[in-house]
Interface confidence: low
């Protein structure tokens, strides 16, 4: 679909004369009537197959004719087609005269005809103006002539139909030739596909609209680059969605169930020793005078023996007291009342004075103790054995029998074959006499947790659309990510038919 | 223990728009793994899920009220809101906020609730 | 939206029984995305049953839930005086989330 277009410049018929030669009265009224037809090698009389168009009258006689266009006038003459323009064309255009008002072809004598002139020829579809001129014995006519298209019609035959548009069908404007140039942010063939945010990630992100990036399930940032961890995972990360992969010393289907008790959570108390004895589970090897599963309790002041010199000890309601055997004194009984003279020392120790014989020193034989050397050293009164190991006398040193799992100098060490976390999948380890067992939590079996019996939801491929099939591990379902242009549980509708809900 | 408190007017005229707050305390806003709601409960005790907000600003809404309603998320403050505009009386209705675990939209904590009225 | 439909409108029972509530729904649900509410005059819902029969932390083990498709069912092993309430079914893998009418359990 396009326009010829026609613009008389100029008319010349200087001596006002019609085609017959006879003049006009009193001048020639002169109007034009053009003929746009399809191309013949010789211009013939017959229909105006591609149009006709008639003016008023412009002028008398010589005239130049007023380009009109910006006015809502007629010249240019405009002569539409809704056809592809074939490249060629036959143009006739007639000068006539009007003796009176009524210009139509019945009413005008047959030798009203000023000049006739016919061309043909090849025109191409563009902007630019043709100027012709063409001449008779008696009249000059200067002209100009082009082809444009249509609104929305493009292309060297104005055959290619383009209207810019910026909705849900297409965001584009049109190109010279036709074709489709994407408003920003858009792409595709008829640009309905929004360019998502850059770096938006190709599988698990995707847009409605430009510079977006909205994430498929299981996945999440800002450019859904980053899986999301099975719901509930405690102490885990995950590569793919829905995993639940533990940090170091967290074990169990939620990475919830701690397998490092001690560093996390520092449970015992009053400066006591902490050992990890599997799941969640722990022991406490607490400093003299504290007892209780944390060593959270303070023991009687007397249980730490705190009366010297033999003296005994008795509990009292604001703390203790020493009754001090005779010669000794003091809060301890640390006091002596006697000196080297009186043989204090027992069991061959050999006696020193001090402060001018005030007082003295007992120095004790080995296995013997005490200011005045009167105990035999019994080196397992402070419980010096860890894990209820038992404590031996043996001469002058001692010994710590170790319940199994333990070993060192104080049954400090433990060897307990749970220590190296051997139950997969968050199993609790328990430590046997001659070895150990797992008890596995739903869904794993095997001497170790290794075997999974739980039920793979996605054996049946349960997901349309070459969507990926994730299994949820607590729940023995499946979770379907879907590809671009799907939505619904399981990826079965085409995004646009139900109402999509990005979860 | 996550705790949700809505506050804002009792009262509200009709054709202007409703505005409520839910300040979320005991938990965090900003966790990935939530969605933050508003519910309502018609006199007639219907329920009924106006639409939730994640912690990144992105929103869904009950496409029968889409046209009226904006949710949005200030996670410095620790609160979610509420507009819903062009109100009617048809809009009177106790107002829940809740807190949806992502992926799984049931709502294990809700806040006490607010009646709103829509009267002039 | 799919549409719950809960039954019997109102359960009228004495302490001690049995309970039984029914949720159907307009079209098939993923027995992962119901969930089942309680609730008391002038208090907020609270969560019995996630997952059409997981219960909710701190919920007693009379409360039960089963069922998948379009046919769900909420049960109340032996009603306690604090049962007698509002119940709501509630979905949730379509949008936008629905709930169902209500059953009531009032004391006969």
């Known amino acids: 679909s396009g326009v010829f277009q026609l613009q008389l410049q100029e008319f010349i018929n200087e001596r006002g004369v019609l085609a017959s030669g006879r003049p006009c009265e009193p001048g020639c009224r002169t109007f034009f009537r053009v003929c746009l037809k399809h191309f013949q090698a010789v211009v013939s009389p017959g229909p105006c197959t591609f149009g006709t168009v008639s003016t008023p009258v412009l002028g008398t006689n010589s005239f130049a004719v007023r380009d009109d266009s910006s006015g809502g006038g007629r010249n240019p003459l405009q002569l539409p087609f809704n056809f592809t323009w074939p490249g060629t064309f036959s143009l006739i255009i007639e000068a006539w005269h009007a003796p009176g008002d009524d210009l139509r072809p019945e009413a005008l004598p047959p030798d009203a005809l000023i000049s006739k002139i016919a061309i043909q020829g090849s025109l191409a579809v563009g902007q630019n103006w043709l100027l012709d001129e063409q001449t008779s014995t008696l009249t000059r006519l200067r002209y100009s002539y082009r082809v444009i298209c249509s609104d929305n019609y493009y292309g060297d035959n104005c055959s290619r139909l383009c209207k810019k548009r910026n909705d849900h069908f297409g965001h584009y404007v049109c190109q010279p030739d036709g074709n489709l140039s994407c408003l920003p942010g858009w792409t595709g063939e008829y640009c309905q596909q929004p360019i998502c945010l850059s770096g938006c990630h190709e599988q698990n992100g995707y847009c409605s609209k430009p510079a977006e990036c909205l994430c498929r399930p299981g996945w999440q940032g800002r450019l859904c680059n980053e899986c999301i961890p099975h719901n509930g995972c405690r102490h885990g990360t995950c590569s793919t969605p829905w995993q639940c992969t533990c940090d170091e010393g967290w074990g169990g289907l939620f990475c919830d169930q701690d397998l490092n008790y001690c560093t996390h959570h520092s449970p015992c108390k009053n400066g006591a020793t902490c050992s990890n004895s599997g799941q969640r589970s722990y022991t406490c090897t607490c400093r003299p005078g504290y007892t209780g599963v944390d060593c959270e309790l303070e023991l009687s002041e007397c249980d730490s023996n705190p009366c010297r010199n033999g003296g005994s000890c008795k509990d009292q309601e604001d703390g203790y007291h020493c009754l001090c055997p005779p010669g000794y004194y003091g809060l301890h009984c640390e006091h002596s009342t006697l000196s080297c003279a009186d043989s204090p020392c027992f069991n061959g120790g050999s006696c020193r004075e001090r402060n001018q014989g005030a007082n003295y020193a007992c120095e004790c034989p080995p296995n013997f103790t005490g200011s005045n050397c009167e105990k035999k050293v019994d080196r397992c009164t402070s419980n010096p054995c860890a894990n209820g190991g038992q404590c031996l006398n043996r001469g002058p040193s001692r010994m710590c029998r170790c319940r199994p799992g333990f070993t060192g100098t104080y049954c400090e060490l433990h060897v307990s074959d749970c220590a190296r976390n051997p139950c997969a999948h968050g199993g609790t380890c328990h430590d046997l006499e001659n070895g150990l067992m797992c008890t596995c939590p739903a869904g794993f079996s095997g001497r170790r947790c290794e075997v999974r019996t739980s039920i793979d939801a996605c054996a049946s491929s349960p997901c349309f659309n070459r969507a990926t099939c994730y299994t949820d591990l607590s729940t023995d379902t499946f979770v379907c990510n879907c590809p671009y242009g799907f939505v619904g549980s399981r990826c079965e509708f085409p995004v646009g038919l139900p109402p999509s809900f990005p979860w | 223990q996550v705790q949700l408190q809505e506050s804002g007017p009792g009262l509200v005229k009709p054709s202007q728009t409703l505005s409520l707050t839910c300040t979320v305390s005991?938990?965090?806003?900003?966790?990935?793994?939530?969605?933050w709601s508003w519910i309502r409960q018609y006199p007639g005790k219907g329920l009924e899920w106006i639409g939730y907000?994640?912690?990144?600003?992105?929103?869904h809404y009950n496409p029968s009220l889409k046209s009226r309603l904006t949710i949005s998320i200030d996670t410095s403050k620790s609160q979610f809101s509420l507009k819903l505009s062009s109100v009617t009386a048809a809009d009177t209705a106790v107002y829940y906020c809740?807190?949806?675990?992502?992926?799984?939209?049931?709502?294990?904590?809700w806040g006490q609730g607010t009646l709103v009225t829509v009267s002039s | 939206e799919i549409v719950l439909t809960q039954s019997p409108g109102t359960l009228s029972l004495s302490p001690g029984e049995r309970a039984t509530l029914s949720c159907r729904a307009s079209q098939s649900v993923s027995s992962r995305y119901l969930a089942w509410y309680q609730q008391k005059p002038g208090q907020a819902p609270r969560l019995l049953i996630f997952?059409?029969?997981s219960r909710a932390t701190g919920i007693p083990d009379r409360f039960s839930g089963s069922g998948s498709g379009t046919d769900f069912t909420l049960t109340i092993s032996r009603l306690e005086p604090e049962d007698f309430a509002v119940y709501y079914c509630q979905q949730y893998g379509s949008s936008p989330l629905t709930f169902g009418g209500g059953t009531k359990v009032e004391i006969k």
């Open positions: 005991g938990g965090s806003i900003s966790s990935g793994g939530y969605y």
């Open positions: 809740a807190r949806a675990p992502r992926g799984y939209h049931y709502f294990a904590y």
């Open positions: 907000v994640h912690y990144s600003g992105s929103t």
């Open positions: 997952g059409a029969s």
